[in-house]
């Protein structure tokens, strides 16, 4: 297993609609034809997988239909969007990149992006 540098922003604030986007960039040694991207969430020392996608270089990322993630790729950058976030989902979201093919296998894990989610205040009743 070869190590690979992965960069991602330190902090991202989710929108009022619970959507957060960030870029995951990996220092590719070349042009992998098959890349796997996984988003992990770390909170309270527990790590869980949020979503994952394997893509062929030059093609779009395809997450499972029920995934809360969408994304696009451009060269050695992956633009990730996580939807449906609520305040309780605030945490450190780690980008993991694997060069699956051709060999050798490369693995890179970012330092994580702290995503802050603030639930919107309910609108006050209006007397119109």
């Amino acid at each position: 297993c070869k190590a690979m540098h992965v960069a991602q922003p330190a902090v991202v604030l989710a929108s009022s609609r619970g959507i957060a986007s960030f870029v995951c960039e990996y220092a590719s040694p070349g042009k992998a034809t098959e890349v796997r991207v996984t988003v992990l969430r770390q909170a309270d020392s527990q790590v869980t997988e949020v979503c994952a996608a394997t893509y062929m270089m030059g093609n779009e990322l395809t997450f499972l239909d029920d995934s809360i993630c969408t994304g696009t790729s451009s060269g050695n950058q992956v633009n990730l969007t996580i939807q449906g976030l609520r305040a309780m989902d605030t945490g450190l979201y780690i980008c993991k990149v694997e060069l699956m093919y051709p060999p050798p296998y490369y693995l890179g894990i970012g330092n994580g992006t702290q995503i802050y989610v603030i639930d919107p205040e309910p609108c006050p009743d209006s007397d119109f």
Partner: antibody
């Protein structure tokens, strides 16, 4: 740590075939990566000749394609270059080097000088 | 093939000063650019890959930047061992190609 070492005759006559071998230690060439030849004429820049892959695939620089053959011997963990119909312009230091597919060259041999002269 | 053009051909800089080397690609190569240092009688040594990432063991005074067709290698404070020839290299498209080199000499 991977090491690459070129070997072959230092003098080749015009119209003959240049043959070089690169011995690899510290990594099994059948496990991955692409194994390249690069040359550098005296006082000039670097020219990529081509690669042979861990899987036997190859790609040669179109400018040399008609004269180049590369092969791999996994039992000896080495790969080879043959360049036919050489002329004086093929005089150069020849390097073997390793890269990831369509990647930068992370490991190089020390180079071997080949002179084409009668 | 993609032509990599380096400038200047020779750069004279005093030790301790900053050196800026340029490389232009004839077409978009994204960030698939590497830089190598070569000293007389030696093989090229990788310095930078993927435009801006230092190869293992390379001092922080070496940095790379750019994207698309314009790339730069910067050496922030030249040491005596930095005087050498520097090559840029594109690995976006086969055939892989190199610039013609920039010779960095002592002023």
């Amino acid at each position: 740590q991977v090491q690459l070492q070129e070997s072959g005759p230092g003098l080749v006559k015009p119209s003959q075939t240049l043959s070089l071998t690169c011995a690899v230690s510290g990594y099994s060439i059948s496990s991955g990566y692409y194994w390249n030849w690069i040359r550098q004429p005296p006082g000039k820049g670097l020219e990529w000749i081509g690669y042979i892959g861990y899987d036997g695939s190859n790609y040669y620089n179109p400018s040399l394609k008609s004269r180049v053959t590369m092969s791999v011997d996994t039992s000896k963990n080495q790969f080879s270059l043959k360049l036919s119909s050489v002329t004086a312009v093929d005089t150069a230091v020849y390097y073997c080097a390793r890269n990831y597919y369509s990647g930068y060259f992370d490991s190089w041999g020390q180079g071997t000088t080949v002179t084409v002269s009668s | 093939e993609i032509v990599m053009t380096q400038s200047p051909a020779t750069l004279s800089v005093s030790p301790g000063e900053r050196a800026t080397l340029s490389c232009r690609a004839s077409q978009n190569v994204g960030t698939y650019v590497a830089w190598y240092q070569q000293k007389p009688g030696q093989a090229p040594r990788p310095l930078i890959y993927s435009t801006s990432y230092r190869y293992s063991g390379i001092p922080a005074r070496f940095s790379g930047s750019g994207s698309g067709t314009e790339f730069t290698l910067t050496i922030s404070s030249l040491q005596s061992e930095d005087f050498a020839v520097y090559y840029c290299h594109q690995y976006d498209t086969y055939p892989l190609t190199f610039g013609q080199g920039t010779k960095l000499e002592i002023k």
